[in-house]
Interface confidence: low
């Protein structure tokens, strides 16, 4: 999501941000959920060979080999079973890294909403970050950029999108007359509201930050149960629980 109308953040002040790369190029964003798990948008991985994918943590300037950076391959991808590429419905996936991140000042976790949390209501102040272009003309950012946005009423957003939204989408607006938000190169990055990942960058309009087509996110709170179910089922356990079986290939 190219961040429009934003600002460069203090380096490593968003330690949960992940850069998903293919062919050595930044492709999408994501956030670190657990030391071995990254949440991103499902559409980022359509027709992509996971073997060529890398996840970079602890980055600020992507073009620099910063000492804080940790680079991982992608062990497994779990896309939401109801993801629909045409409508962007249920646009969420989980990446299991091929190693565990070492948590520290530059690499940290971001929590999703609680299982019973309600999504942010219209007017809530949030922020969205990414390494995408900073203009409509493929201008690269100096480092990780962030924009402050506000949650938009779903009726208003749905009207702007001609009725095409689904119930598990979340929208934002700039909050003032300036163009502010994301576009297309950092899908999967988190919308952070009240220090929780309430949204995942999903899609937007032709022009960055255009209020006529507000930014649309996957509403994370609708998928919290699914997220933790995937993590629980796929993570190695200390020992089998009574009445359960370990997933194939998982060592005790």
């Amino acid at each position: 999501a190219q961040i429009i109308g934003g600002h460069e953040v203090t380096p490593h002040s968003r330690p949960y941000m992940a850069s998903v790369r293919f062919g050595g190029q930044h492709h999408c964003g994501g956030f670190l959920l657990r030391a071995r798990w990254v949440v991103s948008a499902a559409h980022c991985f359509s027709h992509r060979d996971l073997r060529t994918g890398l996840v970079v943590l602890g980055a600020h300037v992507l073009s620099t080999a910063e000492p804080t950076q940790q680079v991982f391959g992608i062990d497994a991808l779990t896309t939401h079973p109801d993801y629909h590429p045409m409508t962007h419905a249920n646009d969420i996936c989980l990446l299991r890294l091929n190693g565990s991140a070492v948590l520290g000042p530059a690499v940290g976790l971001l929590r999703p909403p609680g299982r019973r949390a309600r999504p942010p209501t219209a007017g809530t102040r949030c922020r969205v970050a990414g390494w995408g272009f900073v203009s409509d003309f493929e201008e690269l950012p100096p480092g990780l950029m962030e924009a402050k946005v506000r949650v938009l009423d779903p009726d208003v957003c749905n009207s702007s999108w001609k009725g095409h939204l689904t119930l598990t989408m979340l929208c934002t607006r700039s909050g003032d007359s300036h163009r502010r938000g994301f576009c297309s190169a950092d899908s999967g990055g988190p919308l952070v509201c009240r220090n929780r990942a309430h949204g995942l960058v999903s899609f937007s309009g032709l022009w960055c930050g255009d209020p006529k087509t507000p930014d649309v996110y996957t509403q994370v709170s609708a998928f919290v149960a699914w997220i933790w179910d995937v993590v629980r089922r796929s993570s190695p356990q200390p020992g089998p629980l009574p009445g359960t079986t370990r997933p194939p290939g998982e060592a005790a």
Epitope: R118, T121, P154, D155
Partner: antibody, heavy 122, light 107 residues
Amino acid sequence: EVQLVESGGGLVQPGGSLRLSCAASGFTFTNNSISWVRQAPGKGLEWVGAISPNNGSTYYADSVKGRFTISADTSKNTAYLQMNSLRAEDTAVYYCARNAWHYSWVGVMDYWGQGTLVTVSS
Amino acid sequence: DIQMTQSPSSLSASVGDRVTITCRASQDVSTAVAWYQQKPGKAPKLLIYSASFLYSGVPSRFSGSGSGTDFTLTISSLQPEDFATYYCQQSYTTPPTFGQGTKVEIK
């Protein structure tokens, strides 16, 4: 098929209490907030309040604040409207309705129950 | 609270007539307006949401328009089953508020 079924209405004296139930089926109860809307005889619609069943958050109209309490039992897919200190002007048909948008606190109501009549009279 | 004022409060029309009901909000509500139809003894039914979007299963003779403070519900060719009371509702801010209703009667 989405269904909302209210029950618990009846005749009650001024100052009395009544609890209405709204049994929901055909959708994921915790994904949508539930509103209560009332309609006095021959009058228009008035929103009473709403609950988000997934965390129990509630919101009330000023006219009922402090007297009415909305709750939900997610294990039973049921929302409740507890009405205390009832007045004659609370006489109405009470409807529960599903709020269509997952993240709208209250908003467009796409499915409604059949309503239950509450009469407050001595 | 935002006030929603409907006009007219009632109207008489014949089958086949074009009927227009208006709703005015006391402040800007963008396009966050819904329209409902209610028949005697029945619950309201959603017709239009987001000012102009036809709800699933609603006949195409119903249409909505407007943004800001002024909104319109139009029935292009009134059918016998359309005689009912119609309500507008803003969902822009809490609490949601309804118009007082417009009763469409047979002429």
